[in-house]
């Protein structure tokens, strides 16, 4: 099939006091090969400091996956989700409030 770029969605949730968990989800993409990682100041976090989801079919002939990490509240600006798929790349910031979901479709 032809290339379908991912929708990228970054959310945040409360973790322990002073910390938040940030999750980056990529969905509706094809083919399944994708790089999705959290960056701190533009530098990828070590694998063992991120939690990873499998790349799974989402039922529409496309795929989905996610990656999460824990950060200090107030340091959201330092963190971005980096995505690379089929030769295209993008970076996605952490939303400033926990009530908004940010969706971006990348071509």
């Amino acid at each position: 099939g032809s290339t379908v770029p991912p929708m990228v969605n970054v959310t945040r949730s409360e973790a322990s006091e002073g910390n938040i968990t940030v999750t980056c989800r990529a969905s509706s993409f094809y083919p399944r090969n994708i790089i999705l990682t959290w960056r701190q100041d533009g530098v990828s976090l070590s694998h063992d400091t991120q939690q990873w989801g499998d790349v799974l079919p989402d039922g529409n002939g496309t795929y989905q996956t996610w990656v999460a990490t824990r950060i200090c509240r107030g340091e959201e600006q330092r963190f971005t989700c980096y995505m690379e798929h089929s030769g295209n790349h993008s970076t996605h910031p952490v939303p400033s409030g926990n009530s908004h979901h940010h969706h971006h479709h990348h071509h």
């Epitope: 400091t49 824990r70 790349h89």
Partner: antibody
Framework: EIQLQQSGPELVKPGASVKVSCTAS????????IYWVKQSHGKSLEWIGY????????ISNQKFTGRATLTVDKSSSTAYLHLNSLTSEDSAVYYC???????????WGAGTTVTVSS | DILMTQTPLSLPVSLGDQASISCRSS???????????LEWYLQKPGQSPKLLIY???NRFSGVPDRFSGSGSGTDFTLKISRVEAEDLGVYYC?????????FGSGTKVEIK
């Protein structure tokens, strides 16, 4: 080959401003942040800040807030460090640098010498 | 700001010697998620610094295996197992776990 080409030396008067450029080649410019580091003569290194060329977002050392402005021109793959209200304390070599996958300053420019003198 | 204290400031060596440089941070540089952004750089006269070690103990590409990094929390060490002439210069530790990022004051490795 990945390279960061910096602009030439600058001699400026106290109170003036200066704009140092850093032109990237050999990679997709928007993939990696550009960092700026100051080194006064015979001294250690001092982190100024960084810019994400993809979003234009910046994080800076508070010590330089209001004095240093970081910008990029994506069309020419060039990052800029603009320093204003210069004093003799700003006389230094200014480096741009680029991170890699898991490291901060994997590639460095050759440095730009800024001399502030009347 | 996190202060990075390097010792010694000067390290006279004979070629072939082992050299050890210590770097101590004023507070832990282990980030909330477990990431420790501690790096080591070598700067030779008239040159830009060059990366040796990243994330405490990982050698950068092209760096000889005589260089090794170790440590955790607040105490970090760079070791050179057998010093060669090309290793002479000023070594800096650097932390990027917390803003502002900070460098150590440097350790000059020179011939005895």
């Amino acid at each position: 080959e990945i390279q960061l080409q910096q602009s030439g030396p600058e001699l400026v008067k106290p109170g003036a401003s200066v704009k140092v450029s850093c032109t990237a080649s050999g990679y997709a410019f928007t993939k990696y942040n550009i960092y700026w580091v100051k080194q006064s003569h015979g001294k250690s290194l001092e982190w100024i800040g960084y810019i994400d060329p993809y979003t234009g977002g910046t994080i800076s050392n508070q010590k330089f807030t209001g004095r240093a402005t970081l910008t990029v021109d994506k069309s020419s793959s060039t990052a800029y460090l603009h320093l204003n209200s210069l004093t003799s304390e700003d006389s230094a070599v200014y480096y741009c640098a680029r991170p890699g996958s898991y490291w901060y300053f994997g590639v460095w420019g050759a440095g730009t010498t800024v001399t502030v003198s009347s | 700001d996190i202060l990075m204290t390097q010792t010694p400031l000067s390290l006279p060596v004979s070629l072939g010697d082992q050299a050890s440089i210590s770097c101590r941070s004023s507070q832990s540089i282990v980030y909330t998620n477990g990431n420790t952004n501690l790096e080591w750089y070598l700067q030779k006269p008239g040159q830009s610094p060059k990366l040796l070690i990243y994330k405490v103990s990982n050698r950068f590409s092209g760096v000889p295996d005589r260089f090794s990094g170790s440590g955790s929390g607040t105490d970090f060490t760079l070791k050179i197992s057998r010093v060669e002439a090309e290793d002479l210069g000023v070594y800096y530790c650097f932390q990027a776990s917390y803003v502002p990022f900070t460098f150590g004051s440097g350790t000059k490795v020179e011939i005895k």
